[in-house]
Interface confidence: medium
Amino acid sequence: QERRFQLEGPESLTVQEGLCVLVPCRLPTTLPASYYGYGYWFLEGADVPVATNDPDEEVQEETRGRFHLLWDPRRKNCSLSIRDARRRDNAAYFFRLKSKWMKYGYTSSKLSVRVMALTHRPNISIPGTLESGHPSNLTCSVPWVCEQGTPPIFSWMSAAPTSLGPRTTQSSVLTITPRPQDHSTNLTCQVTFPGAGVTMERTIQLNVSYAPQKVAISIFQGNSAAFKILQNTSSLPVLEGQALRLLCDADGNPPAHLSWFQGFPALNATPISNTGVLELPQVGSAEEGDFTCRAQHPLGSLQISLSLFVHWKPEGRAGGV
């Protein structure tokens, strides 16, 4: 005669794909201490067990190695451990205790396991700031992964120069030595759970700190089109009395501080403009000479100069003689 017992706890449990869940089971208190038998967990309806401690009974292919009967009759434990949960595991399960020496067995009530889509995503952590030319360790972690599951496979994707560091069951380290051109590019950590065939990823944009690499001056003369100077220029002819607007532009992250100096400044010189714009409303003799734009940045500075050469208006010269 079959004896029935109720599984303690909830009638259903939820687990995310690729993760683990413990189906609690306690052997009935009425079970005699002398009851020697084997335990079997079954998927409702199927007559091949999903887990057992019976050496003569083979379990289902689909659950082999993933479902384990945690058998400890002295502690009345008959719980079922499920790892690498798959969508197909979404079913009702029951436990059966059978003995070859006793006339009766014990069968539990049913418990439903609901397998949901994996919603957790990997975390990417960056210690401090990323500096161009300096190696940094980035960690991709999946702290919600259970230790007994099949270790996930970590993949990194980045245009920046990288090398793989140490990894654990729950994390992978990537050493990155970013370049200025890697700023604002994507870095992706992809985590695959081979036991369940599920892949999750997280993508971040790299924020790379770097000193200015390029500084340029755009020159606006009156109403004429602007032109750009990308390197130090010996002389730029300008007509006396003409309005001139000099616009300095530099890269670098975070943005460099731009300032204008007359002449070739010393480090502690006072700027004539604390922005990237220098307005010269009427060019005269006082403006003849060198103007320097300096791009200052915590990681290094860069400057560019241009030399103004003033052409005097012919009538102006005659009036002065």
């Epitope: 199927a46 007559d47 009974e57 083979e58 292919e61 689909e62």
Partner: antibody, heavy 121, light 107 residues
């Protein structure tokens, strides 16, 4: 749709052996043991035994030990039963069946169409 | 092994009549009994599981009752398509066993 397709009728001589097949479709073959049942002409049903497709592990009714041998081919989802040292007593219809095994009941929910075995000289 | 005795061996009824099949177990088996119908040259078909639980796709005129050692399958209004052999099966103890069957005939 679950289907169990059995091989055709067999006419064999006494003392010979015969091997019949049962091809399963419409479900995961390894989730269910394949059971075999004998029905002699005009008589009732007798459970012969079952086989676990995962490892070929078998369980036999004592009466059929030494008479029947159950095997499977997992890749083709096919179960086989070989009967040896045949006598006229073995003339019968043999069914393969899938057992629903639940927490509150177990019963044969799907049956093959049967293979008729005639043992005659 | 548990012995299942079905009676009578043959039942003869007129269409529309109510009919009952009996199945007796040699020892108490709770409600672990199942009923099958087998038409001529056909395979057994599950009618009732666990003594009284209905099966989807089976006409509602079929019902089951009983527990312990005595079980009954009833057809409340017999139709001509019900001509068949009826078997009970126990799943309480290994090995599973079947009753000897009852043949239903139409007068």
């Amino acid at each position: 749709e679950v289907q169990l397709q059995q091989s055709g009728p067999e006419l064999v001589k006494p003392g010979a052996s015969v091997k019949m097949s049962c091809k399963a479709s419409g479900y995961t073959f390894t989730d269910y043991k394949m059971h075999w049942v004998k029905q002699s002409h005009g008589k009732s049903l007798e459970w012969i035994g079952n086989i676990n497709p995962n490892n070929g592990g078998t369980s036999y009714n004592q009466k059929f030990k030494g008479k029947a041998t159950l095997t499977v081919n997992k890749s083709s989802s096919t179960a086989y039963m070989e009967l040896r040292s045949l006598t006229s007593e073995d003339s019968a219809v043999y069914y393969c069946a899938r057992r629903y095994y639940g927490s509150s009941s177990s019963y044969f929910d799907y049956w093959g169409q049967g293979t008729t075995l005639t043992v005659s000289s | 092994d548990i012995l299942l005795t079905q009676s009578p061996a043959i039942l003869s009824v007129s269409p529309g009549e109510r009919v009952s099949f009996s199945c007796r177990a040699s020892q108490s088996i709770g409600t672990s009994i199942h009923w099958y119908q087998q038409r001529t040259n056909g395979s057994p078909r599950l009618l009732i599981k666990y003594a009284s639980e209905s099966i989807s796709g089976i006409p509602s005129r079929f019902s089951g009752s009983g527990s312990g050692t005595d079980f009954t399958l009833s057809i409340n209004s017999v139709e001509s398509e019900d001509i068949a052999d009826y078997y009970c099966q126990q799943s309480n103890s290994w090995p599973t066993t079947f009753g000897g069957g009852t043949k239903l005939e139409i007068k």
